[in-house]
């Protein structure tokens, strides 16, 4: 009994049929970040909750040391939201004085690390200039897309400034992936 | 004939094989909101179009009284976008006068209600400070992630201020979920 | 052997079982845009990379002439992010002078074209007023949702101002769809 007996006859079947419930999946939620060393030309990676509350990993999708480990090759939907919060910086004052300047910014990157590759691959980036008029500001950056990943690939979320990440609620800052 | 005969032998199958087309799915679109009473410590819930235009519910996923009803336990991808629009608030004027203040904000929450639980669970939150310089402003907040839901769970979208929701177009403000 | 033998007995099966790996899928990434003519009452459409880097199309999902072609009827998750960048416009200056005005804005629309329909259908819209205080600004708009599409439908991404699209990195601006 072959998988393609259930597929339209004009279509090539690349994978055996399988139950959806056994596909690798993970949803990770925010924890308070602690300062760490990171590679010189790379934003720092966030670490995550993987068991408590809304967080889970299942079907061989594991979380270890800031990375989601891809247990099986295939097409995955990968997503993250990071909520940032901060105080107004000099930025708006300099601008009010009429001098042009490089804007302050907040950036989220979902990065793929493949051990056989020397350089990480940036899968998704959300980047936003921040020059708020008021005293406190907060805002989310959301990312999500589909990628062809290989068994053994590792995914992480990097941010431009770890101290601005809102760690207070699991629904504000999160990271997930699932095999399609 | 067991489901796992089609799955890689090293992997546990948690669910029988099933046709993708029969999975519970819904995409709901915005309608003009009418003011209603809401629980004291909870943002008001939006109500939705579930049949006309781009909106649909299928395969036992039903919409009733502001809630999407989950007909079957499993992992769901849940998403929403809410487009807000408003006029400049006090906020920027107060700031121009040099007095610091808490910023105005816009917030979207996707909430899960489980009848056996006394408290709703906030699955996703997008929250943003709003202190626009100009007269009119508008902007979307997008959310989406995967959650393990149980049969009988109910999902709703809550917003901080129902009167700021842009109800004019079905592509601007929407809410959906589908079983993975 | 019928598909529904694997599905819960209370549930109607609408499609035959099929391998997930053979479903139509695409992830397209940004390229530098060239100015082109576009329909009078429609925002210009972006064109995309479909083979190099992170971009791919598979299983009869094809890209041609700014359009993703839907090869098979079904429910698709469709997404896009466009990162915009620009300089401060008249907007903030006019406002500083105290005269109210319509805000500048950035807009992304995911549009469906059906040959048998005279008018395109807007599936998703993200629109945001832009009145930045500083000299340079940049920000993403993300969209994603599920739609019931028909074989032969065509999808495109339209933007309000093609010259503001950040084409510099494949992770900043992208467009994708996959059959659920």
């Amino acid at each position: 009994l072959k998988g393609q007996e259930f597929a339209p006859s004009h279509q090539q079947v690349y994978a055996p049929l399988r139950a959806d419930g056994d596909k690798p999946r993970a949803h990770l939620t925010v924890v308070r970040q602690t300062p760490t060393q990171h590679l010189k030309n790379q934003f720092p990676a966030l670490h995550w909750e993987h068991e408590l509350g809304l967080a889970f990993t299942k079907n061989r999708m594991n979380y270890t040391n800031k990375f989601l480990l891809i247990p099986e090759s295939g097409d995955y939907f990968v997503y993250s939201q990071v909520t940032f919060r901060g105080m107004t910086s000099e930025c708006s004052e300099i601008r009010q004085a009429g001098r042009p300047n490089k804007p302050d910014s907040i950036t989220v990157v979902i990065t793929k690390v493949t051990d056989s590759y020397p350089e990480p691959t940036q899968l998704l980036m959300g980047t936003k200039s921040v020059c708020e008029v008021g005293s406190n500001w907060f805002q989310p950056i959301y990312l999500g897309a589909m990628f062809s990943l290989q068994e053994g690939d590792k995914l992480m979320v990097n941010v431009s400034d770890i101290s601005l990440v809102d760690y207070t609620k699991e629904d504000k800052t999160f990271f997930g992936a699932f095999l399609l | 004939l067991k489901g796992q005969e089609f799955a890689p032998s090293h992997q546990q199958v948690y669910a029988p094989l099933r046709a993708d087309g029969d999975k519970p799915r819904a995409h709901l679109t915005v309608v003009r909101q009418t003011p209603t009473q809401h629980l004291k410590n909870q943002f008001p819930a939006l109500h939705w179009e579930h049949e006309l235009g781009l909106a649909f519910t299928k395969n036992r996923m039903n919409y009733t009284n502001k809630f999407l009803l989950i007909p079957e336990s499993g992992d769901y991808f849940v998403y929403s976008q809410v487009t807000f629009r408003g006029m400049t608030s006090e906020c920027s004027e107060i700031r121009q006068a040099g007095r610091p203040n808490k910023p105005d904000s816009i917030t979207v929450v996707i909430t899960k209600v489980t009848d056996s639980y006394p408290e709703p669970t906030q699955l996703l939150m997008g929250t943003k400070s709003v202190c626009e310089v100009g007269s009119n402003w508008f902007q979307p907040i997008y959310l989406g992630a995967m959650f393990s839901l149980q049969e009988g769970d109910k999902l709703m979208v809550n917003v901080s201020d129902i009167s700021l929701v842009d109800y004019t177009k079905e592509d601007k403000t929407f809410f959906g979920a589908f079983l993975l | 052997l019928k598909g529904q033998e694997f599905a819960p007995s209370h549930q109607q099966v609408y499609a035959p079982l099929r391998a997930d790996g053979d479903k139509p899928r695409a992830h397209l990434t940004v390229v530098r845009q060239t100015p082109t003519q576009h329909l009078k009452n429609q925002f210009p459409a972006l064109h995309w990379e479909h083979e190099l880097g992170l971009a791919f199309t598979k299983n009869r999902m094809n890209y041609t002439n700014k359009f993703l072609l839907i090869p098979e009827s079904g429910d698709y998750f469709v997404y896009s992010q466009v990162t915009f960048r620009g300089m401060t416009s008249e907007c903030s200056e006019i406002r500083q002078a105290g005269r109210p005005n319509k805000p500048d804005s950035i807009t992304v629309v995911i549009t469906k074209v059906t040959d048998s329909y005279p008018e395109p259908t807007q599936l998703l819209m993200g629109t945001k007023s832009v009145c930045e205080v500083g000299s340079n600004w940049f920000q993403p708009i993300y969209l994603g949702a599920m739609f019931s599409l028909q074989e032969g439908d065509k999808l495109m991404v339209n933007v309000s101002d093609i010259s503001l699209v950040d084409y510099t990195k494949e992770d900043k601006t992208f467009f994708g769809a996959f059959l659920l």
Partner: antibody, heavy 116, light 107 residues
């Protein structure tokens, strides 16, 4: 291991400037904020300002006109400069690293006396 | 600026006691309330952040509670090494502000 260490002049003459350096290890200044706090017998703990990972700064408005915070990411150093010191600026000056709302790790402090 | 008030400037307790130190903000600080411990040698450590969350490495006998403007730090079982001054700090709005401190002594 996260460490912060302040080094300052100890003694500063009235109306002169104060310069203190905070040298950090165990984390990268490019992606983490550093606050300055001082403690004087008369005023308790007083927050002076912060420099964020991206380089933006915030100052206590009461001191803003004579305070400047800068950094050198490559040397893992943050600099506090304060002008026109008076006797009530005598205090222990601390640098601390933290999230947007709290100071997670503190240096041991450096004592500054303003006196002629 | 937001004023932070610790009404008790010093407190005497016996080893093993349950000790509570209070702090009041002049306006709602949305749970952005932190507690620090300063030892006699001047060393400062974060104990509790965001009202009730224990910083890494802090013993579980420390706990925090409160909301709005009223907050408290509790030490459930006082130990010798807890002899220190405790400061509250609001992290909701700039400038960050501290309470004047509560000095804890052994009876």
């Amino acid at each position: 291991q996260i460490q912060l260490k302040e080094s300052g002049p100890g003694l500063v003459a009235p109306s002169q400037s104060l310069s203190i350096t905070c040298t950090v290890s165990g984390f990268s200044l490019s992606s983490y904020g550093v606050d300055w706090v001082r403690q004087s017998p008369g005023k308790g703990l007083e927050w002076l300002g912060v420099i964020w990972g991206f380089g933006g700064t915030n100052y206590n408005s009461a001191l803003k006109s004579r305070l400047s915070i800068s950094k050198d990411n490559s040397k893992s150093q943050v600099f506090l400069k304060m002008n026109s010191l008076q006797s009530d600026d005598s205090a222990i000056y601390y640098c601390a690293s933290g999230n947007f709302d709290a100071m997670d790790y503190w240096g041991q402090g450096t004592s500054v006396t303003v006196s002629s | 600026d937001i004023q932070m008030t610790q009404t008790t400037s010093s407190l005497s307790a016996s080893l093993g006691d349950r000790v509570t130190i209070s702090c009041r903000a002049s306006q709602d600080i949305s749970n952005y309330l932190n507690w620090y411990q300063q030892k006699p040698d001047g060393t400062v450590k974060l104990l509790i952040y965001y009202t009730s969350r224990l910083h890494s490495g802090v013993p579980s006998r420390f706990s925090g509670s409160g909301s709005g403007t009223d907050y408290s730090l509790t030490i459930s079982n006082l130990e010798q090494e807890d002899i220190a001054t405790y400061f509250c700090q609001q992290g909701n709005t700039l400038p960050f502000t501290f309470g004047s401190g509560t000095k804890l002594e052994i009876k």
